[in-house]
Interface confidence: medium
């Protein structure tokens, strides 16, 4: 692999990371917008920081940091930055794989935990504005009512519930959506993992090439 290959590798890594950095900026910006406007509120009071805004801010920030390391490391041919980029991607990949395994193993436990959290939040609907905002957003967006159905609202369904008497529950609808889109979710997850592995491979290859080039020109 000569100088031209090194250049190609360097710019491919740079442009892809630049693209991801811009995406990260957008996600972070959207997260900040959600935090400011607080449209979605808090659904799980046992996890108060688990809001849509916070999730977007964290994900956006991680993408921005990783992409920045990739951009600067490739364009400046900086081994330290490239290795940091490689290690961060490896940590993210391992975290994703661990999370996937845990979700698979503890699916039933997670379902129970989520259902309990949702039941608790339904009881807070009239007393907590943040919970009210969260439920209203979800019910309007998913066109659903309650956790499993309208009868979850013991004092009658709120205005955000669709007018259909036999509307489906939100937890039910979300699970159904997940199950019916399982293939697409799987494909997206695999694509993300492939992109991460490619990023790691490119970073490692570029790192090795920098070493070889340095030796060739006698540095």
């Amino acid at each position: 692999m000569g100088m031209s290959s090194l250049k190609l590798l360097k710019y491919v890594l740079f442009f892809f990371n630049l693209l991801f950095w811009i995406c990260g900026c957008c996600i972070l910006g959207f997260g900040i917008y959600l935090l400011i406007h607080n449209n979605f509120g808090v659904l799980f009071h046992n996890l108060p920081s688990l809001t849509l805004g916070n999730v977007f801010v964290i994900v956006g920030s991680i993408i921005m940091v990783v992409a920045f390391l990739g951009c600067m490391g490739s364009i400046k041919e900086n081994k330290c930055l490239l290795m940091s980029f490689f290690i961060l991607l490896l940590i993210i990949l391992l975290a994703e794989v661990t999370l996937a395994i845990l979700l698979f193993v503890y699916e039933q436990k997670l379902n129970e935990y989520v259902a309990k959290g949702l039941t608790d939040s339904i009881h807070r609907y009239h007393s907590d504005n943040s919970t009210k905002a969260a439920w209203d957003s979800i019910q309007s967006f998913l066109q659903c009512c309650g956790i499993n159905g309208t009868s979850d609202w013991t004092s009658g369904p709120p205005a955000s519930c669709p007018s259909d008497r036999k509307v489906e529950g939100c937890y039910a609808k979300a699970r159904l959506w997940f199950h019916s889109n399982f293939l697409y979710i799987g494909i997206i997850t695999i694509c993300v993992c492939v992109i991460e592995v490619l990023g790691m491979s490119f970073a490692l290859t570029l790192n090795c090439q920098i070493d070889k080039t340095s030796q060739t020109i006698g540095l």
């Epitope: 499993n148 159905g149 009868s151 007018s163 036999k166 937890y171 039910a172």
Partner: antibody, heavy 118, light 112 residues
Framework: QVQLQQPGAELVKPGASVKLSCKAS????????MHWVKQRPGQGLEWIGM????????NYNGKFKNKATLTIDNSSGTAYMQLSGLTSEDSAVYYC???????????WGQGTSVTVSS | DVVMTQTPLSLSVTIGQPASISCKSS???????????LNWLQQRPGQSPKRLMY???KLDPGIPDRFSGSGSETDFTLRISRVEAEDLGVYYC?????????FGGGTKLEIK
Amino acid sequence: QVQLQQPGAELVKPGASVKLSCKASGYTFTSCWMHWVKQRPGQGLEWIGMIHPNGYSSNYNGKFKNKATLTIDNSSGTAYMQLSGLTSEDSAVYYCARDDYAETMDYWGQGTSVTVSS
Amino acid sequence: DVVMTQTPLSLSVTIGQPASISCKSSQSLLYSDGKTYLNWLQQRPGQSPKRLMYQVSKLDPGIPDRFSGSGSETDFTLRISRVEAEDLGVYYCLQGTYYPWTFGGGTKLEIK
């Protein structure tokens, strides 16, 4: 034509659980909710709850929320109701009834007589 | 819960004579879609219930037109213009507007 088949009778011991079935035929099972209704000997009807054929959405009468669990098996076109912690108060006839979505219970099963006795 | 009160508790009618059953709900059964989800069911001795009427006055297929339903909001009536021997049994009203769905206590129709 629409048919809802239920076993005739179940004899169970106090404190035990029982799973009642309701096999549907003659219509598209996945298009209608299924209701369950209780009738104690010589008494009126009580609505237990209803379940959507997706198996996830359900609506319960608060009185039965910790007593009955409704489930669905789409592959066999069967609706189930599990009754737990049975007492003599649970001795009754349990009916399943199809919901024609726009209205209410248009077709009923023959009912399963549950007797709780030691 | 919505309470459905049926009157009379029992009714003894001669064949060919009319019969009337009243059902009152503790709150209006008019739903936001403009429909009133009030049903009438018939349960013959030893049989499972059978729907006669839905949305107050709509007759189910195969139900003779001697049965008719009327009323609105909280007051509803089931009328049988000429009672026949096969009409004996218990009649229930059922509301499907609010959860939990609730039945009336039932009216036993006997033939004199």
